[in-house]
C-alpha cells in the first residue's frame, strides 16, 4: 500500500477539513508555547503544499515522509531556541531521531494559563464573526494543553463544540443552553485526554505486548460473541491506530481509525449486536460511538474454562507451541465471561496463570502442579472487590468533598514528597470515582472503579516522571502496569519522611477567598490540608477533621464580616495557633 506521495495520499483520504485540523493538532501538541497565529500560518503552508502534491504527486518534495515534511516545517519557527530551549536541538537530528526527540519534549504539564471562559455573548459574536478561526482556536487550545489527546477524537469534540454554538447562539436564553454543553464537553474532554494518556504510556513504557493484552481483555468483554480470531484482528488494528497517534502520526492514525470503523460496520454480525446504531452515524460520531459501545450480551452456553486450561493434559503442550497465542486465548475466554471484572484484574489473572505455567510445565508432574491454579485467583479477585466495597461505603458516608479529603490525607501520608498541587489534583480525581462508580450496580462497580483509578494514577506517574521526588512512586509506576493500583494501595505511612517545617505564609488567607467559586474554595482548603499533613504526618484523622471544620468556620465567618480583610488578618493567626495546639 505504498504511495508516491504520502502527504497527497492522506490529504485525499481525509479531506481538506480533517487534514487541516489534524495538522493543527499535531503542531500544537509538539510546539505547545507557540502563538495560535504562528500555527495557523504553518498549517496553511503545509496544506498549500499538500494540494500541489495532490495535483502532481511527482512534484518536488512530495515524496518526502510526513515526519520529514512536518519536522522541517516546525524547525522553521524563528523563536524555537528562546521559547523551547533544548528542544531546538531536535532540529539538528535526522529522521526518525528528530521526531523521537520532539516526542520526548512533549510537556504533560505545560506552563499555560487556565482557559478562561468569556461571556456567552462575546463567544457567540466570535463564533458568528469567524466560525473557522473560532473552531481552530478550540483545537489549538485543547491540543497544546493535552499533548497526547487522541487527535481524531478531538475532531469529534470540535464538531460537538461547533454544534453547541450553532444551536445555542440562536436560543432565547443562550447561557442556559450553552453553558451546560460546554461544561459537559470540558469534563468529557479531560476524561478522554486522561484515558488516552494511559494508552500512550502503556505503549511507550511497557511496549505493544502490554497494550495488546489490555485490548484483548477489553474487546473480549465488549464483544463476547466474537471469535478469538476476530478479536485478535481488531486488537492488531487498534494497536496500530493508537501506536500512530501516540507517536505523533496523526494523519495515519485518523485514516486507520476510519478504516477500522468501516471494517467493524461491515462485519457487525461477527463482532457484536450492539453496533447497529453506531454504524448509521457520520464518521467522527461513528468512531466515537464504536469506541464507547456497551458490552454485548454473553453467549448463553459458554462452557467452564477449567476443561481447556486446567483439566486438559495438553495444557503445557499447547502453551509451549505458541505461548502468546495460548495466553491470549485464555485472556479472551476469561474476559468474555467476566464483564464484572476490571481489565486490570483480568490482566493480573492472565499474568498469574502465565507464571503458574512457567513454573509447572518445568515440573515433574505438571498437571498435579497446576491443578489448583484457579484457586490462586481468589485473593486476586477479592482484593479489588473489597477495596471497591470499602471505599464506596466511605464515599457514601462522607460525600464527595470529604471523601476527597480522606484520600488527600491517605496519599499525602504515603508519598509526602510529591508536590502539593499534584497531590491535590490526583486525590480530587481519585475521589471522583465515588460519584462515577459507586452508584452503579454491583456487576459494573469494579470495572468502572479500578480502570478509572488506573487512568488517574497514570496521571500521577506522568507528572512524577517529569520531576521525580519519591522512590516509592517511581517503583509503583515502573515495575508493573497492571499492578500499579495495588502497589499504590499497599503503600503505608512513609516513616523516613522528615516533616516539613511550619511556614505561616502557607496558612495565611485573604478576603479574595470569598469571591472564589465553590470548587476553587475546596482546592484552597485541600491545599492547606495537604500542607498540614506534610507538617504533621502523624496527625490523626480526627485531629485533621477538627482543624478542617475550624477552617471552614473561620472562612465562613470572615466572608460574612463587613471588613473581610481585617477579619482574615485578625482571625487567621488565631486559627493557625489553635490548629498548631490541636496537632501538638
Amino acid at each position: 500500500d505504498t504511495h508516491k506521495s504520502e502527504v497527497a495520499h492522506r490529504f485525499k483520504d481525509l479531506g481538506e477539513e480533517h487534514f487541516k485540523g489534524l495538522v493543527l493538532v499535531a503542531f500544537s501538541q509538539y510546539l505547545q508555547q507557540c502563538p495560535f497565529e504562528e500555527h495557523v500560518k504553518l498549517v496553511n503552508e503545509v496544506t498549500e503544499f499538500a494540494k500541489t502534491c495532490v495535483a502532481d504527486e511527482s512534484a518536488e518534495n512530495c515524496d518526502k515522509s510526513l515526519h520529514t515534511l512536518f519536522g522541517d516545517k516546525l524547525c522553521t519557527v524563528a523563536t524555537l531556541r528562546e521559547t523551547y530551549g533544548e528542544m531546538a536541538d531536535c532540529c539538528a537530528k535526522q529522521e526518525p531521531e528528530r521526531n523521537e526527540c520532539f516526542l520526548q519534549h512533549k510537556d504533560d504539564n505545560p506552563n499555560l494559563p487556565p482557559l478562561v471562559r468569556p461571556e456567552v455573548d462575546v463567544m457567540c459574536t466570535a463564533f458568528h464573526d469567524n466560525e473557522a478561526t473560532f473552531l481552530k482556536k478550540y483545537l489549538y487550545e485543547v491540543a497544546r494543553r493535552h499533548p497526547y489527546f487522541y487527535a481524531p477524537e478531538l475532531l469529534f469534540f470540535a464538531a460537538r463544540y461547533k454544534a453547541a454554538f450553532a444551536e445555542c447562539c440562536q436560543a432565547a436564553d443562550k447561557a442556559a443552553c450553552l453553558l451546560p454543553k460546554l461544561d459537559e464537553l470540558r469534563d468529557e474532554g479531560k476524561a478522554s485526554s486522561a484515558k488516552q494518556r494511559l494508552k500512550c504510556a502503556s505503549l511507550q513504557k511497557f511496549g505493544d505486548r502490554a497494550f495488546k493484552a489490555w485490548a484483548v481483555a477489553r474487546l473480549s468483554q465488549k464483544f463476547p460473541k466474537a471469535e478469538f480470531a476476530e478479536v485478535s484482528k481488531l486488537v492488531t488494528d487498534l494497536t496500530k491506530v493508537h501506536t500512530e497517534c501516540c507517536h505523533g502520526d496523526l494523519l495515519e492514525c485518523a485514516d486507520d481509525r476510519a478504516d477500522l470503523a468501516k471494517y467493524m460496520c461491515e462485519n457487525q454480525d461477527s463482532i457484536s449486536s450492539k453496533l447497529k446504531e453506531c454504524c448509521d452515524k457520520p464518521l467522527l460520531e461513528k468512531s466515537h460511538c464504536l469506541a464507547e459501545v456497551e458490552n454485548d450480551e454473553m453467549p448463553a452456553d459458554l462452557p467452564s474454562l477449567a476443561a481447556d486450561y486446567v483439566e486438559s493434559k495438553d495444557v503445557c503442550k499447547n502453551y509451549a507451541e505458541a505461548k502468546d497465542v495460548f495466553l491470549g486465548m485464555f485472556l479472551y475466554e476469561y474476559a468474555r465471561r467476566h464483564p464484572d471484572y476490571s481489565v486490570m484484574l483480568l490482566l493480573r489473572l492472565a499474568k498469574a496463570y502465565e507464571a503458574t505455567l512457567e513454573k509447572c510445565c518445568a515440573a515433574a508432574d505438571p498437571h498435579e502442579c497446576y491443578a489448583k491454579v484457579f484457586d490462586e485467583f481468589q485473593p486476586l479477585v477479592e482484593e479489588p472487590q473489597n477495596l471497591v466495597k470499602q471505599n464506596c461505603e466511605l464515599f457514601e458516608q462522607l460525600g464527595e468533598y470529604k471523601f476527597q479529603n480522606a484520600l488527600l490525607v491517605r496519599y499525602t501520608k504515603k508519598v509526602p514528597q510529591v508536590s502539593t498541587p499534584t497531590l491535590v489534583e490526583v486525590s480530587r480525581n481519585l475521589g471522583k470515582v465515588g460519584a462515577k462508580c459507586c452508584k452503579l450496580p454491583e456487576a459494573k462497580r469494579m470495572p468502572c472503579a479500578e480502570d478509572y483509578l488506573s487512568v488517574v494514577l497514570n496521571r500521577l506517574c506522568v507528572l512524577h516522571e517529569k520531576t521525580p521526588v519519591s522512590e516509592k512512586v517511581t517503583k509503583c509506576c515502573t515495575e508493573s502496569l497492571v499492578n500499579r493500583r495495588p502497589c499504590f494501595s499497599a503503600l503505608e505511612l512513609d516513616e523516613a519522611y522528615v516533616p516539613k517545617a511550619f511556614n505561616a505564609e502557607t496558612f495565611t488567607f485573604h478576603a479574595d477567598m470569598c469571591t472564589l467559586s465553590e470548587k476553587e474554595k475546596q482546592v484552597k482548603k485541600q491545599t492547606a490540608l495537604v500542607e498540614l499533613v506534610k507538617h504533621k504526618p502523624k496527625a490523626t484523622k480526627e485531629q485533621l477533621k477538627g482543624v478542617m471544620d475550624n477552617f471552614a468556620a473561620f472562612v465562613e465567618k470572615c466572608c460574612k464580616a463587613d471588613d473581610k480583610e481585617a477579619c482574615f488578618a485578625e482571625e487567621g493567626p488565631k486559627f493557625v495557633a489553635a490548629s498548631q495546639a490541636a496537632l501538638a
Epitope: K389, L394, E492, K541
Partner: nanobody
Framework: QLQLVESGGGLVQAGGSLRLSCVAS????????MGWFRQAPGAEREFAAA???????YYADSVKGRFTISRDNAKNTVFLEMNSLKPEDTGVYYC?????????????????WGQGTQVTVSS
C-alpha cells in the same frame, strides 16, 4: 482519644486455639472500624483481620477460615478468635481503631493502637 488494651495472648501448642480481646475506653466505640495486626520478630507489622462499624469482616488470606473477628459494642470490645494455630502465627498482636469506621488492611488508616499481646505457637 481512644485507649486500647489487648489481652488473651499466651503460649499454645500448634493446632490449639486462643481468644484475644481488645477493650476500648473512650467515646462512640461503635462508630470505629477495628482491626487486628500482628508482628513476628524481625518482620513488618501485618494485617490479620478487621471489622467495620456495620459489622462487615475482612481477613488476610493467611488466616481466612481459621480466625474470626467480632465486636460487642455494648462492652466496647473487639475479639479475635484464633483456631488451628500454626507456628507462623507467632508474634505480637495489636488492636487498632479507625475513626472513619472502615476496615481497611493498611496500617495508615488506623490512628489508635494498643500496646500488643504476645502470642506464641509452639510446634
Amino acid at each position: 482519644q481512644l485507649q486500647l488494651v489487648e489481652s488473651g495472648g499466651g503460649l499454645v501448642q500448634a493446632g490449639g486455639s486462643l481468644r484475644l480481646s481488645c477493650v476500648a475506653s473512650g467515646r462512640s466505640f461503635s462508630t470505629y472500624g477495628m482491626g487486628w495486626f500482628r508482628q513476628a520478630p524481625g518482620a513488618e507489622r501485618e494485617f490479620a483481620a478487621a471489622i467495620n462499624w456495620k459489622g462487615d469482616r475482612y481477613y488476610a488470606d493467611s488466616v481466612k477460615g481459621r480466625f474470626t473477628i467480632s465486636r460487642d459494642n455494648a462492652k466496647n470490645t473487639v475479639f479475635l478468635e484464633m483456631n488451628s494455630l500454626k507456628p507462623e502465627d507467632t508474634g505480637v498482636y495489636y488492636c487498632a481503631a479507625d475513626s472513619d469506621g472502615s476496615a481497611f488492611s493498611r496500617r495508615l488508616e488506623y490512628d489508635y493502637w494498643g500496646q500488643g499481646t504476645q502470642v506464641t505457637v509452639s510446634s
